[in-house]
Interface confidence: low
């Protein structure tokens, strides 16, 4: 599984993280987890192994099985949302996962991230620095 090393977005804004996986994992459960340690992070939202999107309060997840990419969106960002998160795939044995650092810029601070042309408050990251975990 691959994803961006870090993502940055403004306070009160939203961000989208895209996590890519290899062929064969299409119908597995995908999840988004918070916490510095992989083995103790807390799952915030997950798919049901289908392409049906799921939304929970300020976070949503959607799996595009054709492109083998699942997308996580966090809205209404607060400063204390800044943390280490993980994109993951549930499987028998250890899950697959990759770490994503979420940085939230305080309101009024200049943001260096590229913004989507349709919404100046949303930053989309596919990640130029990709890495594999596990």
């Amino acid at each position: 599984i691959q994803g961006p090393e870090s993502v940055r977005a403004p306070e009160q804004g939203s961000l989208t993280v895209q996590c890519h996986y290899k062929q064969g994992w299409e119908t597995y459960i995908k999840w988004w987890c918070r916490g510095v340690r992989w083995d103790t992070c807390k799952i915030l939202i997950e798919t049901r192994g289908s392409e049906q999107g799921e939304k929970s309060d300020r976070v949503s997840i959607k799996d595009n099985q054709k492109d083998r990419t699942f997308t996580v969106t966090m809205e209404g960002l607060r400063r204390d949302d800044a943390d280490v998160y993980w994109c993951g795939i549930e499987r028998r044995g250890p899950d697959l996962g990759t770490q994503v650092k979420v940085i939230v810029d305080p309101e009024g601070a200049a943001s260096t991230t590229a913004s989507s042309p349709t919404n100046s408050n949303m930053a989309v990251f596919i990640g130029s620095h990709k890495r594999n975990h596990y």
């Epitope: 918070r34 083995d39 103790t40 992070c41 807390k42 799952i43 915030l44 939202i45 997950e46 929970s56 309060d57 300020r58 976070v59 966090m74 209404g76 607060r78 204390d80 949302d81 943390d83």
Partner: antibody, heavy 126, light 107 residues
Framework: QVQLVQSGAEVKKPGASVKVSCKAS????????VHWVRQAPGQGLEWMGI????????NYAQKFQGRVTMTRDTSTSTVYMELSSLRSEDTAVYYC???????????????????WGQGTTVTVSS | DIQMTQSPSSLSASVGDRVTITCRAS??????LNWYQQKPGKAPKLLIY???TLQSGVPSRFSGSGSGTDFTLTISSLQPEDFATYYC?????????FGQGTKVEIK
Amino acid sequence: QVQLVQSGAEVKKPGASVKVSCKASGYTFTTYAVHWVRQAPGQGLEWMGIVNPNSGGTNYAQKFQGRVTMTRDTSTSTVYMELSSLRSEDTAVYYCARDIVPMNNFYNYYYGMDVWGQGTTVTVSS
Amino acid sequence: DIQMTQSPSSLSASVGDRVTITCRASQSISSYLNWYQQKPGKAPKLLIYATSTLQSGVPSRFSGSGSGTDFTLTISSLQPEDFATYYCQQSYRIPYTFGQGTKVEIK
């Protein structure tokens, strides 16, 4: 003191809906998420879902998806749980319970239930 | 969904006994495990959260341990007011499932 006070017992016919209220006092209503848990007679506890009183955002157990609606009214510090298409298996005591972790500390991060309502008995019978 | 299995489902003990209740999760839940006590006709009461953190006002004779899939609630010296049903609950993954309960009865 911190407390959750629920509405009174209800008797409903199969197919009907029931709406249970849970009024919070003694703390900042919008700071803590509220869970709903039910317990059928002589049975264990079953988690139904959670509502964020600040945003109104919800997350339901798949089992109740499509039948349950959890809402809140910040002006009265009250959360509501409405269950539709009632059947006899829905006969239970329904509890609201406050999450132990203030929501401004974490993002979508629910822990456990430290303050409980007294429970509302819902009986479904023809 | 994550299945939570408690054992035993019931036990008989005397005042002063050391009582241990175990809870097993169908998959790893890290340390996101809570314990509740419920008496007949009453709402549950939180005893321990995050595996081992004692909720405010709960006597120190209650303790919790474990991680991953296996957890334990221990009552070091059973008191008359401890006769009740105990439930474990995981808060790792929605839906936040409970164990089936362990009833602690007087021997």
